[in-house]
């Protein structure tokens, strides 16, 4: 007695898909494997699969049931923080080959990485054009205050909404102030912030408010101290320069706003006589420490001049050091002062129409705005490479 | 809390044009694409037309392509329906509704008769 | 387009019972990871309230007592115990691609 195992079905291809080996007949042993087109990959029920092959059964069955070829689908994209994703293709498609378009919150915030275009591929991410799969950033734009120029001189101004939206009023043990970098980092004087080196948290930080003792402001808090290893306390103040990292993003708007660092270009915009413009809550002529946000347009000193007025007693030779630069007027009268220690000294750079820090409020002569004598600032173009580490290693 | 409040509709006679606007509050209304919604009376819902978040694309029913326009202001956070050369058709309760992959939320309604 | 067939188009039930809704598409409205197939109720001069998203998804805020179900072609909408508040007409909802389509309904009343 002999019998011949029953060929099995053709069979038929799930839409989308091929079977490979294509045969007249399957019979017993005989098998084929679904290969799914790109775009699309293999179900069984739920389930995805790897890869599909059946095996023609003696009974004429195949030993598994036929798999679907569905279409890859890349799931809702991540949320871009500070901006927002737009459906291209279809609302809410995001199935293979559709297309999203990222960006960022208009006027506050500008796109890093790339285009913020992506598209769904075969491997279920989405895919920048450039072929990333991570999600471009939104960097605050720096530098955008509501005021203009610097232009001529004046003095003990009081600041209005918008004019220095990157202060910081630091408060811990001192008055002090900072700027705030991108969204997450304050830039300060060491001296300012030594004492709290290793106590981060004690420091109150505040910002996009106008007054120094209002209710209304927003609170930052500090994750960490960075203070530049070349600073040594109560010994000069070469390398007065610290990072403060927030211990969380704050929310850029037209109060809030970061300041730009210096571009190599920059010095071309600190020559001698160029006006810079210090703002903070420090002491004013009346002695006491600012209630309303004060600022200040002030000239570059001449650094031989400069060095040469800091040499005689009680200053200690070497004081002024070539990370140092000085602003202020020969006949006195214009200055930063005690409290402003650790604020920006910032210029507007008049080919990208941003502001952008030159200096930070360091240390001078006893009595502020003295003739004869210049307000001290760390010269901040000699630390990018410092602040740059600093940043994109925490 | 989440809302959207239609306006705009009334009694309009056909071939005239109409605009509805829906104002959004409690979310960050540039997040979400939008959406209007219709029910004509005693029928079931159809979908009219979708804006993404920023406006970069938009889509619509073959019924209303080239006579409807939707368009939205972020800054006012309103979304609009310009309706020209309505149709007796065109009668219906429209809805405004949030949501790139569903209508998640909608607003009451207002209502559009056009009627000679 | 595609095309959203719900049966029953109108379905008689008491307080307690189970009730089951079912929807056809057209076409597949289902890839690797989702169905984009949604439920919604609503009740007379209200604007409808979606109760159920992906298929199987429960909306915040809406009773347990709501499941749903299926994918491909077939989906269906199931309240294992019916309350009063539940009368209302159901519709389902693709989101598969424009435009996106409705049911004609299930007008659920009391028995």
């Known amino acids: 007695y002999t019998s011949t195992a029953q060929p099995c079905p053709y069979p038929m291809a799930p839409p989308n898909g091929h079977v490979s080996p294509v045969q007249a007949k399957y019979i017993l042993k005989d098998s084929f494997s679904i290969f799914c087109e790109t775009g699309y990959e293999l179900l069984q029920g739920h389930l995805p699969l790897k890869s599909f092959t059946a095996v023609c059964q003696k009974d004429g069955s195949w030993d598994r049931p036929m798999p679907a070829c569905s279409i890859v689908d890349c799931g809702p994209p991540d949320d871009l923080p500070s901006g927002r994703v737009e459906y291209i293709t279809g609302p809410g498609v995001t199935t293979y080959k559709a297309v999203i378009q990222y960006s960022c919150e208009e006027t506050f915030y500008t796109m890093k990485v790339n285009d913020g275009k992506y598209v769904c591929e075969a491997d279920g991410f989405w895919t920048s054009s450039k072929g990333e799969k991570s999600l471009p950033v939104c960097e605050p734009v720096c530098g955008l205050s509501a005021r203009t120029t610097g232009g001529r001189i004046y003095g003990g101004q009081k600041a209005k909404p918008g004019d220095f939206p990157w202060q910081v009023l630091i408060l811990g043990g001192t008055t002090a102030a900072g700027a705030l970098l991108y969204d997450n980092w304050v830039l300060t004087a060491a001296h300012a912030v030594y004492e709290q080196k290793h106590d981060a948290s004690a420091l109150d930080i505040r910002m996009g408010t106008l007054k120094r003792l209002s209710p209304h402001y927003t609170q930052a808090w500090s994750e960490a101290v960075f203070i530049h290893e070349g600073y040594t306390h109560d010994a000069g103040f070469d390398n007065d320069i610290a990072l403060i990292k927030l211990n969380n993003k704050v929310v850029i708007n037209s109060n809030i706003t970061p300041i730009c660092l210096p571009r190599k270009e920059a010095e071309s915009f600190m020559r001698t006589d160029d006006i810079g413009t210090a703002s903070g809550w420090g002491l004013t002529q009346r002695g006491f420490l600012a209630r309303n946000l004060m600022y200040v347009d002030i000239p570059i000193v001449d650094h031989q001049k400069c060095t040469a007025a800091y040499e005689k007693p009680p200053y200690p030779r070497g004081s002024v050091t070539a990370n140092m630069l000085c602003a202020g007027l020969e006949s006195g009268g214009k200055d930063s002062c005690r409290g402003d220690s650790g604020g920006a000294l910032v210029f507007l750079d008049s080919e990208t129409e941003r502001w952008f820090v030159g200096g930070i409020v360091s240390w001078g002569s006893m009595n502020c705005g003295e003739a004869g004598q210049y307000g001290v600032y760390t010269k901040v173009i000699n630390y990018i490479p410092w602040i740059e580490n600093i940043i994109s290693d925490f | 809390q989440v809302q959207l409040v239609e306006s705009g509709g009334g009694v309009v006679q056909p071939g005239r044009s109409l605009r509805l606007s829906c104002a959004a509050s409690g979310f960050t209304f540039s997040s979400f694409g939008m959406h209007w919604v219709r029910q004509a009376p005693g029928k079931g819902l159809e979908w009219v037309a979708y804006?993404?978040?920023?406006?970069?694309?938009?889509f619509y029913v073959d019924t209303v392509k080239g006579r409807f326009t939707i368009s939205r202001d972020n800054s006012k956070n309103t979304l609009y329906l310009q309706m020209n050369s309505l149709r007796a058709e065109d009668t219906a309760v429209y809805y405004c509704?949030?949501?790139?992959?569903?209508?998640?939320?909608w607003g009451q309604g207002t209502t559009v008769t056009v009627s000679s | 387009d595609i095309q959203m067939t719900q049966s029953p188009s109108s379905l008689s039930a008491s307080v307690g019972d189970r009730v089951t809704i079912t929807c056809r598409a057209s076409q597949s409205v289902s890839s690797s990871r989702y169905s984009y197939m949604h439920w919604f109720q609503q009740k007379p001069g209200k604007a409808p309230k979606l109760l159920i998203y992906?298929?199987?998804n429960l909306e915040s805020g809406v009773p347990s007592r709501f499941s749903g179900s299926g994918s491909g072609t077939d989906f269906t909408l199931t309240i294992s115990s019916l309350q009063p508040e539940d009368f209302a007409t159901y519709y389902c909802?693709?989101?598969?691609?424009?435009?996106?389509?409705f049911g004609q309904g299930t007008k659920l009343e009391i028995k």
């Open positions: 804006i993404s978040s920023g406006s970069s694309s938009s």
């Open positions: 992906h298929a199987s």
């Open positions: 509704a949030r949501g790139d992959r569903n209508f998640e939320v």
């Open positions: 909802q693709q989101s598969w691609e424009v435009p996106w389509t």
